[in-house]
Interface confidence: low
């Protein structure tokens, strides 16, 4: 039985040209995380964090994606095209797969606030 819950940074906004941290956290389960996949809104994989092998950043994103903190992902040099949904997929044993959703809005405005609160989607 899957008892865990994915908490995410929820809906966040950030300035064009700036950086943002995408963070998911798996709680309420003793399951061991074997791999975390990070996907963009078009379902293209940004990065993978394998518990044994470490990080793999996909070549198309190498210049703008930094691993961490933790199992999270840092997007840099944001463009308006980065606006959209991001998904973290936690592969665990013995529970199976958990998935979290984050919506990122990239704003032109210099007063854009980066909300770092955690919420359960």
């Amino acid at each position: 039985m899957m008892t865990g819950t994915i908490e995410t940074t929820g809906n966040i906004s950030a300035k064009k040209g700036g950086s943002v941290i995408l963070q998911c956290h798996l709680s309420s389960t003793m399951a061991q995380v074997t791999q975390v996949n990070w996907e963009q809104h078009d379902h293209s994989l940004l990065a993978i964090r394998n518990a044994e092998l470490g990080w793999h950043i996909y070549p198309a994103f190498k210049d703008r994606v930094a691993p961490g903190p933790g199992l999270g992902l840092t997007l840099q040099s944001l463009t308006m095209n980065d606006t959209g949904e991001y998904f973290c997929t936690y592969h665990t044993y013995p529970d199976g797969t958990y998935r979290g959703r984050i919506f990122l809005e990239v704003l032109e405005s210099s007063v854009a606030e980066h909300s770092a609160r955690f919420q359960i989607p």
């Epitope: 061991q32 791999q35 394998n50 044994e52 092998l53 470490g54 793999h56 044993y93 797969t97």
Partner: antibody, heavy 125, light 106 residues
Framework: QVQLVQSGAEVKKPGASVKVSCKAS????????IGWVRQAPGQGLEWMGW????????NYAQKLQGRVTMTTDTSTSTAYMELRSLRSDDTAVYYC??????????????????WGQGTMVTVSS | DIQMTQSPSSLSASVGDRVTITCRAS??????LNWYQQKPGKAPKLLIY???SLQSGVPSRFSGSGSGTDFTLTISSLQPEDFATYYC????????FGGGTKVEIK
């Protein structure tokens, strides 16, 4: 075809070190970790650890920690296992094996699908 | 570390017999369980991975089942070339092997 070819048999004295090589061919070396397994005469299989050929990450069995070092040379598609401070109970056949774990499988398959022919290491005074 | 207990440690059987070997994990390992066959002087050979998936090229008389803590390797009709030692191995880090089951000719 896909294969792993290991270096030849070794005879070592207690306290010495041994380095076993494992040359891969027939597949993309950096796509899979290499695991090392040993088997003492007449005994079962013992997992020693593995190394990611992709980024050099290692994971060693706790009982060998501090005595074992696993490395790879991606230019020659070769993995190495060095065991130091040898004791008589290290006498065994040492196998390298391709570990099916990979970034592109969410599951930790961790099955060894291709094995080297084995290297006999004898530790004797 | 997760301990793997295999039983029996040895068994005698005849060609054509149905043979069952069991493997028990000290804690749940989901389906992260593999089976190998080893003949004297040879490297082990992967038979079954992920508890029940048959490795390419392995005869269909071999099958695996189970999940959680209890697993089974079945040889539906033992052939002369099947007399060997069989090992289970769990792949939750760190990997560990069972003690082996020697299948001998009755």
């Amino acid at each position: 075809q896909v294969q792993l070819v290991q270096s030849g048999a070794e005879v070592k004295k207690p306290g010495a070190s041994v380095k076993v090589s494992c040359k891969a061919s027939g597949y993309t070396f950096t796509s899979y970790p290499i695991g090392w397994v040993r088997q003492a005469p007449g005994q079962g299989l013992e997992w020693m650890g593995w190394i990611s050929s992709y980024n050099g990450n290692t994971n060693y069995a706790q009982k060998l920690q501090g005595r074992v070092t696993m490395t790879t040379d991606t230019s020659t598609s070769t993995a190495y296992m060095e065991l130091r401070s040898l004791r008589s109970d290290d006498t065994a056949v040492y196998y390298c094996a391709r570990d099916l774990s990979s970034f592109w499988s969410g599951d930790v398959l961790g099955a060894f699908d291709i094995w080297g022919q084995g290297t006999m290491v004898t530790v004797s005074s | 570390d997760i301990q793997m207990t295999q039983s029996p440690s040895s068994l005698s059987a005849s060609v054509g017999d149905r043979v069952t070997i069991t493997c028990r994990a000290s804690q749940s390992i989901s389906s992260y369980l593999n089976w190998y066959q080893q003949k004297p002087g040879k490297a082990p050979k992967l038979l079954i991975y992920a508890a029940s998936s048959l490795q390419s090229g392995v005869p269909s008389r071999f099958s695996g089942s189970g999940s959680g803590t209890d697993f089974t390797l079945t040889i539906s009709s033992l052939q002369p070339e099947d007399f060997a030692t069989y090992y289970c191995q769990q792949s939750v880090p760190p990997r560990t092997f069972g003690g082996g089951t020697k299948v001998e000719i009755k």
